[in-house]
């Protein structure tokens, strides 16, 4: 058999460290900010700034805190009950279908279209056809007019909570 991790090696959530408050589970569940101990008898605090849990749970591990990537700003830090809130930097946005990275906002609308929405941390500029008023799909054609926009002011955070 393998014999590798000693009690000293174990991650803090597996030790009864002084800074980790323990309490008893309520009906088998531990409160937000805690996970259940391996023996099922205690609730152990998540490690501030390292992991978290948002709901009553019987998890053996807390969830890892998100670390904001370069190109993101941290709106609020990770606590034991809430994940880090990261937001794309000015001039970039995060799409729902590719939430793992911030993309640059377009600088202008294609020919024959007008801008009706600014760049925000969660959306590209919005363009509509001058005549019909229908939205542009978001694909950028090869030729663009020099209709430029300044990045919009962030209105709300884009949370990557797990």
């Amino acid at each position: 058999e393998s014999a590798l991790i000693t009690q000293q090696d174990l991650a803090p959530q597996q030790r009864a460290a002084p800074q980790q408050k323990r309490s008893s589970p309520s009906e088998g569940l531990c409160p937000p900010g805690h996970h259940i101990s391996e023996d099922g008898r205690d609730c152990i605090s998540c490690k501030y700034g390292q992991d978290y849990s948002t709901h009553w749970n019987d998890l053996l591990f807390c969830l890892r805190c998100t670390r904001c990537d370069s190109g993101e700003v941290e709106l609020s830090p990770c606590t034991t009950t809430r994940n880090t809130v990261c937001q794309c930097e000015e001039g970039t946005f995060r799409e729902e279908d590719s939430p793992e990275m911030c993309r640059k906002c377009r600088t202008g609308c294609p020919r024959g279209m007008v801008k009706v929405g600014d760049c925000t941390p969660w959306s590209d500029i919005e363009c509509v056809h001058k005549e019909s008023g229908t939205k542009h799909s978001g694909e950028v054609p090869a030729v663009e007019e020099t209709v430029t926009s300044s990045p919009g002011t962030p209105a709300s955070p884009c949370s990557l909570s797990g």
Epitope: E1, S2, A3, L4, I5, D9, L10, A11, Q14, G28, I36, S37, E38, D39, G40, R41, D58, L59, L60, F61, L63, R64, T66, P99, E100, L160, G162
Partner: antibody, heavy 115, light 109 residues
Framework: EVQLLESGGGLVQPGGSLRLSCAAS????????MSWVRQAPGKGLEWVSA????????YYADSVKGRFTISRDNSKNTLYLQMNSLRAEDTAVYYC????????WGRGTMVTVSS | FMLTQPHSVSESPGKTVTISCTGS????????VQWYQQRPGSAPTIVIY?????PSGVPGRFSGSIDRSSNSASLTISGLQTEDEADYYC?????????FGGGTKLTVL
Amino acid sequence: EVQLLESGGGLVQPGGSLRLSCAASGFTFSSYAMSWVRQAPGKGLEWVSAISGSGGSTYYADSVKGRFTISRDNSKNTLYLQMNSLRAEDTAVYYCVKGAWLDYWGRGTMVTVSS
Amino acid sequence: FMLTQPHSVSESPGKTVTISCTGSSGSVARNYVQWYQQRPGSAPTIVIYEDNRRPSGVPGRFSGSIDRSSNSASLTISGLQTEDEADYYCQSYNYNTWVFGGGTKLTVL
């Protein structure tokens, strides 16, 4: 020194039953979750089931839910896996593993399901 | 969720090799990753836990990392030695189920 010794493997017909045991020593058995992990011949590792240190919580992979039952006897420092309605695809080496981190593994016991 | 690893990698002694482990649906971004080494005919042993921590007895040549943007974990082995030839498995945890990658066979040429 942590030691985990599995037993109870063998040849069984499809639809049959088998009970695996794991004798543990070298650590405070009741303080740790325990798992069974299996490995089919020439294949990768597959987690099967886990149980909390007190035995109050049990967890199962979808592939064995309703057929396998994990249990433990803390007074005997022994982990069990009761396997019913066995199928050919359950053929594997079954490892007894200590802790939520799966940090110590036994040598395994072979279970063969064949007619 | 699933964890996907390359089937095999190979490198010469003394060199550095990296084995990737890509998760589905943000799983690796949220949950800690462990790595196990399994030499032929032996039980697995843990070489990295909680993303990048090394148990005692595991050489400093082994290191782990996480890349949230690609939802992947990596195991890097530097100064490759012939005894590093083995199967390597990543593993993570998703609400009280333990999930393994398919394994990567490392060949030291």
